[in-house]
């Protein structure tokens, strides 16, 4: 019998009282087969967190800070359920830290230093701990002890607290520092009063502090938000302009064995029975004998944190980068201008050779980071162990929804101003055999499907688009008799024409042989009775342009396009029957690398792109015999985006919108992860 | 963004023509699909014709518009066209112009469609 109990820790007395209701009442409520509580007692949230992973106990609630030593080794814990607020149509899970300005002030972030600042307190998360943190590298040193690196950064500040007999430039703005209400310039409503009193330049607080303190929009329309990429923005698009995103109180479990569905079982049972006005006897989110016991008082109920999720995705890039800074205290040498080397996310074995091979070319410019698949290399990216990648239009958008942007586009056709001029498209074609000849768009159900992969556009968005358009359910493996459609689940039908073996079978990478454009033309030579590919893929692998032995007798001739009217068409008449005209790949990255990115990616091309003639000789980096590594084959030159800078832009408005409503038949759990960060 | 605006329709006899255009701004690159949809009183709207901007290719959704009805465009101006020749008063409705940037011709569903038109009213009299 699975033990079903979960062993909660509380760090005070109070805490183990309630926790002992807590576990009294769930048992009157729930059957005896079902989620149970036993309380374990700490000195700490640090004892709580390494009991956890001795698996002395199994759950603990922490706020952002807790959250972080939490994930670090040797504890390895991950967020499992979050506590929310607000209401249940708009939870409110993240709350956003922000820097205020008044509008006329007319510097950016990176102007900071030799203005003065208002804090909501020394140590806290808003007002103190992540813009210190984001800052940190550009403090005088030496930054220890931190608070007089602070205090000669800016020219004053009131950092309530904070000791202003030894750093009186921290009080200056709040004589004597008072470290509660008594301070008119203490916590978030202090700190922006600080701001609005014109005592300082900029506020460090939370998002919603200036809507709580201004409640006329005319009011609010004199403040600015500071943007770590040098703009300003209104104060309501504090979702774009912030410095990190933090989560409110989140319950930790251990990543293996960490029984986190029981977690969520138990609290989700106990959230519809003793949450927010349920029961007079027991509730869950109120202390009589304290303050924010085991939970926040103010919390409304709880979410289940998606599993694709560790701490460093659900804390955000910056919120780490914030607190990794003020931990370790590590800055490179000296700051400078020079771009550091461009960290590369390679999928697998293949693109690792290739990425290698453009490294040690690049003279250091380019590094290599593994991933096994596309997710997880925007995962990489979005933590920083990576830097960017070339995607297609599928994974562009689920990057995007992760809050990484498009810099540069991939270009397939030959023009005189290639690196200007990014294209409308690529076309999204259905391919069969000529002999099949009875095969329509309309008679596709019960056939053999070959598809790039899951996610992607050509090969999966666009026809599953149009496919669940018809037959509004997302039962794909039911409509096709079988297929290789690779990232999708192992025991699926839409798995089973595939060719890796063992464990790289329906792989979404090269491993597995009937991945991408080539391997699902492949799929469809060997075995299935349509291919969901580029109009570019089938002329790419017939008349002996493919070399290998499956390619290399195929003619181009006896393939045809399904075109969405009915009819079918030679090949090369792709403009005239295509499903879709699809966005090229594009490079993705963090908004922090954007402008590093660009400048080393436009030499890289003009020294390794499309102008080297001798491929056999040299590094190439649009070349890999068909198997599009790290690029397409068939790219030209990488094009300026101009305006189309954000995934919502650059893939375009239908496009978004086809890919959201194939969102009700997502398996990415990547994306369900960014969603729970940015609904 | 892309804005599309129709003009033409009006009132006429059965047997009698009428020509609707269809003037679309604001795209750049690549060729698109642009169709003509009607909606009869009390109906959901039906697709009738469809053009491949970047190719000149045309679409009938059937054979009763075919012969009567024809769909061309002038890319100089932008603009998309529908004869409709030999009206019956069963081709009254309101007539919508659309065009996706993303799907091919050929699909007559309206959700893919993108962009959509005010509409011109079409009334055919016996």
């Known amino acids: 019998v699975p033990d079903k109990t979960v062993r909660w820790c509380a760090v005070s007395e109070h805490e183990a009282t309630k926790c002992q209701s807590f576990r009294d009442h769930m048992k009157s409520v729930i059957p005896s087969d079902g989620p149970s509580v036993a309380c374990v007692k700490k000195a700490s949230y640090l004892d709580c967190i390494r009991a956890i992973a001795a698996n002395e106990a199994d759950a603990v609630t922490l706020d952002a800070g807790l959250v972080y030593d939490a994930y670090l080794a040797p504890n390895n814990l991950k967020p499992v359920v979050a506590e929310f607020y607000g209401s249940k149509e708009d939870p409110q899970t993240f709350y956003y830290a922000v820097a205020v300005v008044k509008k006329d002030s007319g510097f950016q972030m990176n102007q900071l230093r030799g203005k003065k600042s208002c804090h909501t307190g020394l140590g806290r998360s808003a007002g103190w701990n992540i813009p210190i943190g984001l800052l940190y590298c550009d403090l005088p040193e030496p930054r220890k002890p931190l608070e007089k690196a602070v205090a000669n950064f800016f020219s004053g500040s009131c950092a309530p607290c904070a000791d202003g007999t030894d750093f009186p430039q921290l009080c200056q703005l709040c004589p004597g520092c008072g470290c509660s209400t008594l301070n008119q310039y203490f916590g978030y409503s202090g700190a922006f009063k600080c701001l609005k009193d014109g005592a300082g330049d900029v506020a460090f607080v939370k998002h919603s502090t200036i809507f709580e303190n201004l409640a006329n929009k005319a009011d609010r329309d004199q403040y600015e938000l500071l943007c770590l990429d040098n703009t300003r923005k209104p104060v309501d698009e504090y979702k774009d302009c912030h410095l990190a995103q933090v989560p409110s109180h989140t319950v930790v479990a251990r990543s293996m064995g960490g029984k986190e569905d029981l977690i969520w079982e138990l609290l989700n049972q106990a959230q519809e029975h003793f949450g927010k006005d349920k029961s007079k006897e027991f509730q869950l989110f109120s202390s009589p004998h304290g303050k924010d016991l085991l939970f926040k008082d103010s919390a409304h109920g709880f979410l289940k944190v998606p599993p694709r999720m560790d701490a460093k995705m659900y804390l955000g890039y910056e919120y780490v980068t914030a607190i990794r800074n003020l931990r370790e205290g590590t800055c490179p040498e000296a700051p400078t201008d020079e771009c550091k080397p461009v960290k590369w996310c390679a999928l697998s074995h293949h693109e690792r050779l290739k990425c290698d091979e453009w490294s040690v070319n690049s003279v250091g410019k380019i590094e290599c980071v593994s991933a096994e698949t596309t997710e997880d290399c925007i995962a990489k990216i979005m933590n920083g162990e990576a830097d960017a990648m070339s995607l297609d239009g599928g994974f562009v958008y689920i990057a995007g929804k992760c809050g990484l942007v498009p810099v540069l586009a991939e270009n397939y056709n030959k023009s005189d101003n290639c690196e200007d001029t990014p294209e409308a498209g690529y076309f999204a074609i259905a391919v069969v055999k000529k002999s099949a000849s009875d095969l329509t768009w309309d008679n596709l159900k019960g056939k053999k499907s070959c598809h790039t992969a899951v996610g992607r556009t050509a090969g999966w968005n666009i026809p599953m688009g149009l496919l669940y358009n018809k037959i509004n359910h997302c039962r794909f493996d039911e409509f096709f008799s079988e297929g290789c459609a690779p990232g999708s689940k192992k025991d699926s039908s839409l798995c089973k024409l595939c060719m890796g073996s063992g464990l790289n079978l329906c792989e979404p990478n090269n491993k597995e042989g009937y991945y991408g454009y080539t391997g699902a033309f492949r799929c469809l030579v060997e075995k299935g009775d349509v291919a969901f590919v580029k109009h570019q893929t089938v002329p790419q692998n017939t008349g002996g342009k493919n070399p290998d032995p499956w390619a290399k007798n195929l003619n181009e001739k006896d393939y045809e396009l399904l075109c969405l009217d009915g009819t079918r068409k030679p090949v090369e008449e792709y403009a005239n029957c295509h499903l879709a005209r699809a966005p090229n790949h594009a490079v993705v990255t963090r908004k922090d690398k954007e402008a590093c990115v660009h400048k080393i990616l436009r030499q890289q091309q003009h020294l390794f792109g499309s102008n080297v003639t001798d491929c056999s000789g040299n590094f190439c980096l649009f070349r890999s015999e068909t198997k599009d590594l790290l690029f397409r084959d068939d790219t030209v030159c990488l094009a300026k985006l101009h305006d189309r800078n954000t995934y919502e832009k650059y893939l375009g408005e239908e496009y978004v919108k086809a890919v959201g409503n194939l969102r009700k038949c997502s398996t990415s759990s990547l994306l369900e992860a960014c969603t729970f960060r940015r609904p | 963004d892309v804005q599309l605006v129709e003009s033409g329709g009006g009132s006429v006899q059965a047997g009698g023509s009428l020509r609707l255009s269809c003037q679309a701004s604001g795209y750049t690159g690549g060729g698109h699909c642009m169709a003509w949809f009607r909606q009869a009183p009390g109906k959901d709207r039906e697709g009738i014709a469809a053009?491949?901007?970047?190719?000149?290719?045309?679409?009938y959704a059937d054979e009763s518009v075919k012969g009567r009805f024809i769909i061309s465009q002038d890319n100089a101006r932008s603009t998309v066209y529908l004869q409709m020749d030999s009206l019956k008063p069963e081709d009254t409705g309101m007539y919508y112009c659309?065009?996706?940037?993303?799907?091919?011709?050929?699909?007559?569903?309206?959700?893919?469609?993108?962009?959509w038109g005010q509409g011109t009213q079409v009334t055919v009299s016996s």
């Open positions: 659309a065009a996706t940037l993303l799907y091919g011709c050929g699909a007559w569903s309206p959700r893919l469609f993108g962009y």
């Open positions: 053009i491949y901007t970047g190719t000149g290719s045309t679409y």
